[in-house]
């Protein structure tokens, strides 16, 4: 039961995370005009990965897409790429994990296949979450750098007569959505990987039967290999239980470091 719950919860958490990553990628508020010195402004600027917007105090909002590809900063392109890779991997991971869910029966799919698919989707979710976190963090770093640069030369005077106030940008809502969503996807992926451990068929609970060949004493242990999930291949000193072997749902899952994002 615990494995099914872990897998199901991992799927749901990842689903929420990927939905968040998609939402963050589409949002216009990646960077918003810094209002620290002027909390009320007649013109409010904010920018996303795909377009920049201006909201006037009149309520009128105007958005303009970045219609150039080559003219955009490399960092912005990199962030776009990371977010898209995260979404694509996450979407594939979701598709794979649907078929891997223990509660869904598809033909005569073996548990070993489900375990493999669970692990695959888990890894995809982890990479997807990392892509999102990396993308958002790169953008945040870019903002911090630009913020202090524009603070250093906040006013660029023309002969000391005319002042041009530079618009400073700070973290927008999309960054926080992205960080949380990336973290959730990552946690979901870890949960799927943990669930995979329990999904893999345990060694059969038969007593070892010994066959004595002439001259040599060889013990043949039937069902001695786990599905090659990467977690439980038959290593030396593996104990074969006489009885009371743990059921797949009793496999203990330990808290991951990612549970404390």
């Amino acid at each position: 039961m615990a494995v099914t719950a872990c897998q199901g919860l991992g799927f749901v958490v990842s689903l929420i995370g990927i939905a968040g990553i998609i939402a963050a990628t589409c949002m216009d508020q990646w960077s918003t005009q810094d209002l620290y010195n002027n909390p009320v402004t007649a013109v409010f600027n904010y920018q996303g990965l795909w377009r920049s917007c201006v909201r006037e105090s009149s309520g009128f909002t105007e958005c303009r897409g970045y219609f150039t590809l080559l003219g955009l900063p490399a960092m912005l392109q990199a962030v776009r790429a990371l977010m898209i890779v995260g979404i694509v991997l996450g979407a594939i991971g979701l598709l794979v994990s649907i078929f891997a869910l223990k509660c869904i029966r598809i033909g005569s799919m073996e548990d070993s296949a489900k375990a493999n698919m669970t692990l695959t989707s888990g890894i995809m979710f982890i990479v997807s979450g990392l892509c999102a976190i990396a993308g958002v963090s790169v953008f945040a770093n870019m903002l911090v750098t630009n913020f202090w640069m524009s603070t250093a030369n906040m006013y660029t005077g023309m002969g000391g007569m005319v002042q041009t106030v530079q618009t400073r940008y700070t973290f927008g809502a999309a960054l926080f959505v992205g960080w949380v969503a990336g973290g959730l996807t990552l946690i979901g992926g870890v949960m799927m990987c943990i669930a995979c451990r329990g999904l893999a068929p345990e060694e059969t609970n038969y007593k070892a039967v010994s066959y004595h060949a002439s001259g040599h004493s060889v013990a043949y242990k039937p069902g001695g290999f786990k599905a090659s999930t990467g977690f439980g291949s038959n290593t030396k000193n593996k104990k074969i239980y006489d009885g009371g072997a743990r059921t797949e749902d009793e496999v203990q899952s330990y808290p991951s470091k990612h549970d404390y994002v």
């Epitope: 002027n38 009320v40 402004t41 007649a42 013109v43 600027n45 904010y46 920018q47 920049s52 917007c53 201006v54 006037e56 105090s57 009149s58 309520g59 009128f60 105007e62 303009r64 005319v162 002042q163 041009t164 106030v165 618009t167």
Partner: antibody, heavy 118, light 113 residues
Framework: QIQLVQSGPELKKPGETVKISCKAS????????MNWVRQAPGKGLKWMGW????????TYAEEFKGRFAFSLETSASTAFLQINNLKNEDTATYFC???????????WGQGITLTVSS | DIVMTQSPSSLTVTAGEKVTMSCKSS????????????LTWYQQKPGQPPKLLIY???TRESGVPDRFTGSGSGTDFILTITKVQAEDLAVYYC?????????FGAGTKLELK
Amino acid sequence: QIQLVQSGPELKKPGETVKISCKASGYTFTKYGMNWVRQAPGKGLKWMGWISTNTGEPTYAEEFKGRFAFSLETSASTAFLQINNLKNEDTATYFCARLVRGNSFDFWGQGITLTVSS
Amino acid sequence: DIVMTQSPSSLTVTAGEKVTMSCKSSQSLFNSGNQRNYLTWYQQKPGQPPKLLIYWASTRESGVPDRFTGSGSGTDFILTITKVQAEDLAVYYCQNVYSYPLTFGAGTKLELK
């Protein structure tokens, strides 16, 4: 058609309070902010501030903080300007104006003349 | 506060003439976010409320004759009236609508010879 109709002229004594109204018609009142502009006799225009007809949140120019208060009666599509503790220098024409795109004022009230005299 | 300086303070013209009036701001009114200049021009005739002519420095309000043209960017703006007519005699105000408070210029009075 869009109209902003202001109340009639006012004659007040120093220290008194006046409440000027601006009734909007011909459009959805809560979609456009309302600005208040003062024009002293023979002088130029001075922006006093504006009120969001959607949230009711007012924004005042520094010079008009304190004695001046913007308010709304949304059900009646009416904006109000209240001036407390009137002074002689408050004698002016007060306009209400609708805030539209470009942060410009496309429709104006006819103006109300306030005279403060002892 | 952004200070708006209009010049000349008054202008005497003959009908059919081309007129230009200037408006300078102490800070740039250009917003890089949408590449627009937040400057508005109004016309006020005696005993009347102001009338919106131009917004975003160069966008003519609907119903305004095309002889009125707004130009300029950043801190320097111009209102041009080609072939002035008698009905154009009024005071013209420019207004900063980029930063609070939304300050007006002192106005340019257009008079007929």
